[in-house]
């Protein structure tokens, strides 16, 4: 039997656990979108705009391993590109499917709408190429299924965006249905045996000699699916384990060997000391960006650094291209306990102590709030922190085990998290309807992407939306222009947003004191994700987590350097 190419695409996506597709309709993709309704278990999210759709696809992929966004040629796809670039930067697998004009229209170089009027139909495809792992423009129905499979595999395996152009006239053509009976091969190609052996032997020798080793889990630990291996590595070796800001949520923070968040000079002193005095650092999935490293302020005393990456390994100054960390870790786990048996476990840095008791009328401040937040969180929560005070503040919160952390530390596109919350909420609902999705976003950031709350309401999704109202772009005020008009924003009536977007079953709260925070977060009904909630957190204008204040100084200095 045969099925249409459009249906083939959606069946393949369903096979790899992608059940929600993001994007907007446009005349070059409408026929494709018809097919989504023919595939049981698939849904079309229907976003408010393409940028938000890209952010949503990113959030969904961080939870489920990959995602798909569909846009239309030119006007639609270009609106998504900032979001797609963020997914590229941060190693997130998003398949970007673009409905393009028919092959005959392209061949005739017709001056169609949504074109630049110059007959060039490849220009937008070329724009996307630099922020995609691979691209495909389908031109031949015979090879189309294999191209779709290649694009899905590449998206998933490399954890990078992939661009797939589908001409409007091809999606209704038929392909053999039996192709769906063979799963797409998602396996990694094995490492070169000789290189892999050299890597493993070298690591084992370093482990054997180490007196003061540490494990540092970073962004690509979760993005490239080695969280389980890393947890086992900690269990087997008992080495102290730390995370970077981008690694937050990639290891269990209730583990007795968890030591805290390492951000170079911005770390707590005892964390800084523990990591920087180590004689061996096993760095899993490092992504050494400025905000992830305290403006490149790592100051290791040792040269014995092993970097585990998805597509290479680095030991001291030697790089081993093509040696993938997944296999290295799996093989290491069979022998590392023996190599580490001489290690005498040292104490890990103490947890941040609980907040001291203060009068209930004490005005809420960030330092107190982020520390207190850990009491509200539950195992399995998805915690999403917007660029700005939230992304820095969340580093002070100790997560329960199995918490998903989402923030965009490297790309840092303001407003990203509203869309990402939508995507994460879809993903969480598909995994477990009781799984909570909790957003922390500033009043300034929210103004860029607020429309996507409407999509959450449309689908009955129930995230917690904590809006930190500190009257403007606080992170930017701290970096430059504390009193500048360009860092000011129009104040909104945040608690009217949910009904404005048509919510019927919702809650709104305004919290300004420590007592109000505790009363709300300890309320049993508030702890169940039974409805969408907007919580406005009233904060002083220049209030910010201390690590952000320090980072802002470093960033300002970097920006001013000649």
């Amino acid at each position: 039997s045969e099925i249409t190419l459009g249906k083939y695409l959606f069946e393949r996506l369903k096979q790899v656990n992608v059940n929600t597709v993001f994007g907007l309709p446009g005349d070059f993709n409408l026929s494709l979108l018809d097919k989504i309704y023919e595939v049981e278990g698939m849904r079309w999210a229907g976003n408010a705009n393409e940028l938000n759709a890209a952010y949503a696809a990113d959030g969904y992929a961080r939870i489920k391993g990959m995602s798909c966004i569909i846009t239309t040629f030119g006007v639609g796809e270009l609106s998504a590109l900032n979001g797609i670039a963020g997914s590229y930067a941060e190693h997130v697998g998003v398949l970007h499917v673009v409905g393009v004009p028919s092959i005959s229209a392209q061949a005739k170089q017709l001056l169609l709408h949504h074109t630049l009027g110059n007959g060039d139909f490849t220009v937008f495809h070329r724009m996307s190429a630099n922020i995609s792992e691979t691209t495909a423009m389908i031109t031949d129905i015979a090879t189309a299924p294999a191209e779709i499979d290649r694009c899905i595999r590449t998206t998933y395996v490399t954890q990078r965006p992939v661009y797939l152009g589908l001409p409007a006239n091809l999606v209704d053509l038929n392909v053999p249905a039996k192709l769906l009976q063979t799963p797409i091969d998602m396996s990694l190609k094995p490492n070169d045996a000789e290189s892999e052996k050299e890597v493993i032997d070298t690591i084992l020798a370093l482990v054997k000699d180490a007196k003061n080793p540490v494990i540092l889990a970073d962004a690509c630990c979760s993005r490239h699916d080695v969280k389980a291996e890393t947890k086992k590595l900690i269990d087997l070796t008992q080495f102290p384990a730390f995370v970077t800001p981008m690694g937050k949520g990639s290891i269990d923070e209730q583990h007795p060997r968890y030591g805290g968040v390492y951000v170079g000079t911005l770390s707590k002193p005892e964390v800084k000391e523990a990591v920087e005095s180590a004689d061996l650092i096993l760095s899993v999935g490092a992504l050494l960006s400025d905000f992830n490293t305290g403006s490149f302020s790592y100051s290791y005393k040792t040269k014995n650094i092993v970097e585990f990456h998805s597509d290479h390994m680095k030991i001291r100054n030697a790089t081993f291209p093509g040696v993938q960390m997944k296999f290295v870790l799996q093989k290491l786990l069979t022998t590392i306990a023996d190599a580490a048996k001489g290690y005498k476990p040292v104490a890990v840095p103490a947890r941040t102590p609980a907040n001291a008791a203060v009068p209930a009328s004490t005005p809420l401040k960030q330092e107190w709030m982020w520390n207190q937040l850990g009491n509200f969180l539950q195992e399995g929560d998805v915690v999403i922190a917007e660029t700005g005070t939230s992304a820095f503040g969340i580093n002070q919160t100790t997560f329960p085990n199995n918490t998903y952390g989402i923030s965009q530390v490297l790309w840092g596109s303001i407003g990203f998290t509203t869309g990402a919350t939508l995507g994460a909420a879809f993903a969480a609902e598909e995994i477990d309807p009781k799984k909570r999705v909790i957003l922390f976003i500033g009043d300034g950031s929210l103004q860029l992407t607020v429309q996507e709350i409407s999509t959450m309401i449309r689908w009955g999704l129930k995230p917690y939306l904590f809006v930190l109202n500190n009257d403007g772009y606080t992170i930017e005020k701290l970096i430059h222009g504390p009193k500048a008009q360009y860092n000011e924003i129009q104040g909104w009536d945040h608690l009217s947003l949910l009904p404005t977007f048509g919510a019927k079953d919702y809650e709104t709260h305004r919290v300004a004191t420590t007592g109000e925070w505790d009363k709300l977060t300890q309320d049993k009904s508030f702890n169940d994700n039974s409805k969408i909630r907007m919580i406005e957190i009233m904060l002083p204008v220049f209030d910010a987590p201390q690590n952000l204040v320090e980072q802002a100084k470093l960033t300002a200095a970097t920006n001013a350097k000649q």
Epitope: E11, K14, Q15, V16, N17, N19, E40, G41, G65, Y156, P183, I184, D185, M186, S187, D225, A228, E379, G380, N402, E430, I431, D432
Partner: nanobody, 120 residues
Framework: QVQLVESGGGLVQAGASLTLSCAAS????????MHWFRQAPGKEREFVAA????????FYADSVRGRFTISRDNTKNMVYLQMNSLKPEDTAVYYC?????????????WGQGTQVTVSS
């Protein structure tokens, strides 16, 4: 981490039916793709069937397609293999297996296996 325990194997006549069950421990069963493999005496272990997280995409080896059905119940952390029209060549140890992500990757976790013997 997930632990897998198979049950339901046994000795049956050719043409009969049998349902294998696999009980999985672990909070996040519904984020694992689930598989059945089998190994006949003196042969390599071979793929039989697999299903994605939601149980709404299923894959089968050509040798069992149309006779075997894989299903899962995420509320009970169970995966099943309904085997109809059994043949002597279906005799093997059947293994339940799980992968943390998608079908199409080598499973991370394996059960101990359950013996199925089909007599002619």
């Amino acid at each position: 981490q997930v632990q897998l325990v198979e049950s339901g194997g046994g000795l049956v006549q050719a043409g009969a039916s049998l349902t294998l069950s696999c009980a999985a421990s672990g909070r996040t069963f519904n984020t694992y793709s689930m598989h059945w493999f089998r190994q006949a005496p003196g042969k390599e272990r071979e793929f039989v069937a697999a299903t994605n997280w939601g149980g709404n995409s299923k894959f089968y080896a050509d040798s069992v397609r149309g006779r075997f059905t894989i299903s899962r119940d995420n509320t009970k952390n169970m995966v099943y293999l309904q085997m109809n029209s059994l043949k002597p060549e279906d005799t093997a140890v059947y293994y339940c297996a799980a992968h943390r992500t998608v079908v199409g990757k080598t499973p991370d976790y394996w059960g101990q296996g359950t013996q199925v013997t089909v007599s002619s």
